[in-house]
């Protein structure tokens, strides 16, 4: 019973985590304009992995995709890759874990097969979570570096009269979503691995019982099941969350256009 609960909980936690990873990857607010110690601007800038957006005081929000692939920073490409790998692994892990759930009966699937599938999905969830955490951390590190660099050159004077204020960026909501989601996926994966141990049938040291019948001596010894790992690796990426991070005023809809001051 405890094994089933651990496995089920691990699945649910991983499902929430992967949904969060997908959400974070789609969100536009990976980095947001730093408003602290900055002149109050009538525009607010924020950036995602796929596009950058500007929200004006007027409520109008304009987003522009990064239509270049080669012109983008290598770090951004690396973060994108890590997040996508995390999503793909997580999606495969979810698919595998569905069939591995003890509460779901699929034909005459043996417990050892379910144990192996649970372990496989657990490992996939762990790697998926680590990918997400790594991706978000790399991006955060990039932000911190750029933040202090732009702080050092905050004001670039032009003849002492004209000043150009550099826009500094700080952590956006997507980073926190990503960290939490990655952590949940990781925890879910660990729970699946723990559940796997409980699912695997143990070698029981029963004494061999001899049955004597009409001169024939046949010994029946309880043996281990043959571990079957022949489950299909269905890589169909099932989207759990398709929301992206639509800021309240990205599309000029009312009344949410001005849900800020």
């Amino acid at each position: 019973m405890a094994v089933t609960a651990c496995q089920g909980l691990g699945f649910v936690v991983s499902l929430i985590g992967i949904a969060g990873i997908i959400a974070a990857t789609c969100m536009d607010q990976w980095s947001t304009q730093d408003l602290y110690n900055n002149p109050v601007t009538a525009v607010f800038n924020y950036q995602g992995l796929w596009r950058s957006c500007v929200r004006e005081s007027s409520g109008f929000t304009e987003c522009r995709g990064y239509f270049t692939l080669l012109g983008l920073p290598a770090m951004l490409q690396a973060v994108r890759a890590l997040m996508i790998v995390g999503i793909v692994l997580g999606a495969i892990g979810l698919l595998v874990s569905i069939f591995a759930l003890k509460c779901i009966r699929i034909g005459s699937m043996e417990d050892s097969a379910k144990a192996n599938m649970t372990l496989t999905s657990g490992i996939m969830f762990i790697v998926s979570g680590l990918c997400a955490i790594a991706g978000v951390s790399v991006f955060a590190n990039m932000l911190v570096t750029n933040f202090w660099m732009s702080t050092a050159n905050m004001y670039t004077g032009m003849g002492g009269m004209v000043q150009t204020v550099q826009t500094r960026y700080t952590f956006g909501a997507a980073l926190f979503v990503g960290w939490v989601a990655g952590g949940l996926t990781l925890i879910g994966g660990v729970m699946m691995c723990i559940a796997c141990r409980g699912l695997a049938p143990e070698e029981t040291n029963y004494k061999a019982v001899s049955y004597h019948a009409s001169g024939h001596s046949v010994a029946y010894k309880p043996g281990g099941f043959k571990a079957s790992t022949g489950f299909g690796s269905n890589t169909k990426n099932k989207k759990i969350y398709d929301g992206g991070a639509r800021t309240e005023d990205e599309v000029q809809s009312y009344p949410s256009k001005h849900d800020y001051v």
Epitope: Q33, N45, Q47, S52, V54, E56, S57, S58, F60
Partner: antibody, heavy 118, light 113 residues
């Protein structure tokens, strides 16, 4: 058609207060910030502040903090500006303007003339 | 606060003439996020409220004749009227639309010669 209709001219005594209105029509009132601008006779334009009619959030120019108070009434699609402790320096035409693309005021009221005189 | 400096303060023109007025800000009004300059131009005739001409430094408001052209980037901006008409005689204001408080230039007055 978008229209901003401001209240009529005011003649007030020094030290008194005045409250002027700006009634909106032809658009969703809560969807746009309403800005207020001061213009002294024969002079330039001076930004006072804005109100967000959706949540009544306000932002003021430092110069007008304590002088101007911006409010709005969703039910009548009207923005208000109250000026307190009036002096001769407050004699001016006050405009309301709707903020749109590019943080530009695309529609303006006809202006409310305030004369402070004893 | 951002200071907007307009020059010249007045211009004497004849109909059909090409007119250029300048506006300079003490800080850049360019936003790298959307590659736009947050400078606005208004026209004000006596006894009337200001009328929006150009926003984002170069985008003409709908209904504004195409003889009005806005240009410039960063801190230096220009409003050009390719062929001045009698109805263009007014005061032209530039406005910082990037930083609060929003600030206006003192204006350029267009007068008949």
């Amino acid at each position: 058609e978008v229209q901003l209709q401001q209240s009529g001219p005011e003649l007030v005594k020094p030290g008194a207060s005045v409250k002027m209105s700006c009634k909106s029509s032809g658009y969703t009132f809560t969807g746009f910030l309403m800005h207020w601008v001061k213009q002294k006779p024969g002079q330039g334009l001076e930004w006072i502040g804005y109100i967000n009619p959706y949540n009544d959030g306000t932002k003021y120019s430092e110069k007008f903090k304590g002088k101007a108070t911006l409010t709005s009434d969703k039910s009548s699609s009207t923005a208000y500006m109250e000026l307190s402790s009036l002096t001769s320096d407050d004699s001016a035409v006050y405009y309301c303007g709707r903020l749109d693309y590019g943080n530009a005021m695309d529609y303006w009221g006809q202006g409310t003339s305030v004369t402070v005189s004893s | 606060d951002i200071v907007m400096t307009q020059s010249p303060s007045s211009l004497t023109v004849t109909a059909g003439e090409k007119v250029t007025m300048r506006c300079r800000s003490t800080q850049s009004l360019f936003n790298s996020g959307n590659q736009r300059n947050y400078l606005t131009w208004y026209q004000q005739k006596p006894g009337q409220p200001p009328k929006l001409l150009i926003y984002w430094a170069s985008t003409r408001e709908s209904g504004v004749p195409d003889r009005f052209t806005g240009s410039g980037s960063g801190t230096d901006f220009t409003l050009t009227i390719s062929s001045v008409q009698a109805e263009d005689l007014a005061v032209y204001y530039c406005q910082n639309a990037y930083y609060y408080p929003l600030t206006f230039g003192v204006g350029t007055k267009l007068e008949r010669k």
